[in-house]
């Protein structure tokens, strides 16, 4: 899977972890840090 | 389906108030930026501005900034675009368009007609 | 707020004929160009994003390429269709249109 950094302009999508390209599919998505979930790592589970 | 639906047609005066309502269904506008884009008759495409839904952070092209005030109402999954001191330039059909996750999606569009 | 210069502004081409248009970014732009095709009294449709992705459903015949500053957008052999203007929108910070490109059939 070819994957590059996000737009600028996605800055601060991800509250909790880092944005990425997924080139092949066309996609933004949030790698979320541990602890954190939801399409942009905005809930937190203990 | 996603779908982005927008309020109807408007006609206003010159100096007058317009706010356009946008309303997403299928999707969580808190997922997405919603983006304004408009389009005067017989022009390109121009860009206004957009809303974060969930952060309520919003980000204006300079020329409209002080004039365009976008907002969201996550209890009703619904952003809207306010646009003041309307003038006759600001005739155009105004798009809100669904970033974030996957790349663009449009809504139908809203005419607004500034006439005395 | 980053510039993009679209040319030309209208071109007359043959059906079968190779077509080009190009955008020039005021910065680089990092391949975060898109590629719309609107019609008369339609909303504006999505053929490619991310320089050269091409949207489901979009035909072969149309491509685009580029880096950095330089992108263009090519329809490989024109069909009646094809017949709308094309706008580049470059997306990689905040968001600019090119003044788009009437395509006329000759």
């Known amino acids: 899977v070819s994957i590059t950094k996000c737009n600028s302009d996605m800055n601060g999508y991800c509250l909790h972890g880092q944005c990425i390209y997924l080139v092949d599919m066309s996609q933004n998505y949030c790698r979320c840090e541990v602890g954190y979930t939801g399409v942009r790592c905005e809930h937190f589970y203990l | 389906q996603d779908q982005l639906v927008q309020s109807g047609a408007e006609v206003k005066k010159p100096g007058a108030s317009v706010k356009v309502s946008c309303k997403a269904s299928?999707?969580?506008?808190?997922?997405?930026?919603i983006q304004w884009v408009r389009q005067a008759p017989g022009q390109g495409l121009e860009w206004m501005g957009r809303?974060?839904?969930?952060?309520?952070?919003?980000k204006y092209r300079e020329k409209f900034e002080g004039r365009v005030t976008i907002t969201a109402d996550t209890s009703t999954n619904t952003a809207y675009m306010e646009l003041s001191s309307l003038r006759s330039e600001d005739t155009a059909v105004y798009y809100c368009?669904?970033?974030?996750?996957?790349?663009?999606?449009w809504g139908q569009g809203t005419l607004v007609t500034v006439s005395s | 707020d980053i510039q993009m210069t679209q040319s030309p502004s209208s071109l007359s081409a043959s059906v079968g004929d190779r077509v080009t248009i190009t955008c020039k970014a005021s910065?680089?732009?990092?391949?975060?160009i898109a590629w719309y095709q609107q019609k008369p009294g339609q909303a504006p449709r999505l053929l490619i994003q991310?320089?050269?992705t091409l949207q489901p459903g979009v035909p072969s015949r149309f491509s685009g390429s580029g880096s950095g500053t330089d992108y263009t957008f090519t329809i490989s052999s024109l069909q009646p269709e094809d017949i709308a203007t094309y706008y580049c929108?470059?997306?990689?910070?905040?968001?600019?249109f090119g003044g788009g490109t009437k395509v006329e059939i000759k």
């Open positions: 299928g999707f969580n506008i808190k997922d997405t930026y």
């Open positions: 929108l470059q997306y990689d910070n905040r968001r600019t």
């Open positions: 910065q680089d732009i990092h391949k975060y």
């Open positions: 991310y320089t050269s």
């Open positions: 809303i974060d839904p969930l952060r309520r952070q919003t």
């Open positions: 368009v669904r970033s974030g996750r996957e790349f663009d999606f």
